[in-house]
Amino acid sequence: DPVKPSRGPLVTCTCESPHCRGPTCQGAWCTVVLVREEGRHPQEHRGCGNLHRELCRGRPTEFVNHYCCDSHLCNRNVSLVLEATQTPSEQPGTDSQ
């Protein structure tokens, strides 16, 4: 088999979500995602990112906030907030572009 291309250096991150296989994970960067689904309290998930770095640049909305960082366990003590609820005419979308 050909040698698999390197994805570059990996960083160790805190992993706290229902899908974590352990207390840490390794990825290209660390993430914190704060999500509020309709009628539920916001949930904060910590983990690793490898794809779609563009989501890190998305501005917070009243439903979601993405945070990314690039150093060892840098997502461990980060707390995010959502945008304050806005009137229907000024609600932002969740599109990251």
Epitope: D1, P2, V3, K4, P5, S6, R7, G8, S17, P18, H19, T31, V33, V35, H45, G47, C48, N50, L51, H52, R53, E54, L55, G58, F63, V64, H66, G93, T94, D95, S96, Q97
Partner: antibody, heavy 118, light 108 residues
Framework: QVQLQESGPGLVKPSQTLSLTCTVS??????????WNWIRQHPGKGLEWIGY???????YYNPSLKSRVTISVDTSKNQFSLKLSSVTAADTAVYYC??????????WGQGTMVTDSS | EIVLTQSPGTLSLSPGERATLSCRAS???????LAWYQQKPGQAPRLLIY???SRATGIPDRFSGSGSGTDFTLTISRLEPEDFAVYYC?????????FGGGTKVEIK
Amino acid sequence: QVQLQESGPGLVKPSQTLSLTCTVSGGSISSGDYYWNWIRQHPGKGLEWIGYIYYSGSTYYNPSLKSRVTISVDTSKNQFSLKLSSVTAADTAVYYCAREGLEAFDIWGQGTMVTDSS
Amino acid sequence: EIVLTQSPGTLSLSPGERATLSCRASQSVSSSYLAWYQQKPGQAPRLLIYDASSRATGIPDRFSGSGSGTDFTLTISRLEPEDFAVYYCQHYGSSLLTFGGGTKVEIK
């Protein structure tokens, strides 16, 4: 194993909105490891990426379709959906949903044909 | 926007022959995010190769991928009857997600 299944009307009237749903079975749409994509293929043509959604609800769209596309997710139903507004004959295509992870688009739905009914 | 150009558009070969398909990117892309798919009429695409050179689960070893930067290649070492299909390359994992136009491998 994880499977994807597209559903929705096969005929859409001109200027109306195309609505399709992709149901994920055998795995959770809320896994942070995956992104959930829509792709289409015009008859006899190549593949055109439409956009993706993450479990958080964050989206990214093909710039050429962005003004008409909305992708949404319902984690409680393990589904994500596509809406394409102001359809014309140029939107007649097979529409696929697909899961994207580190191993690329590793799982696809079987596709659903959508025709402009003009 | 990254444009992926595949060549040739059509490749006419006989079973047992070697097929070499090219995918050229308009700008350098990470080989970690270059994939190849096979599509047969009436079917969804099937993942063959990811990371430019890693075979997907269940893919026979006659399929191999190589390349970096702007030039990538899919090689089928000995064509089997079931390999005659359309092949697409794809850049994934970023906002610049795009497919090549495809190469049709047909029976000569």
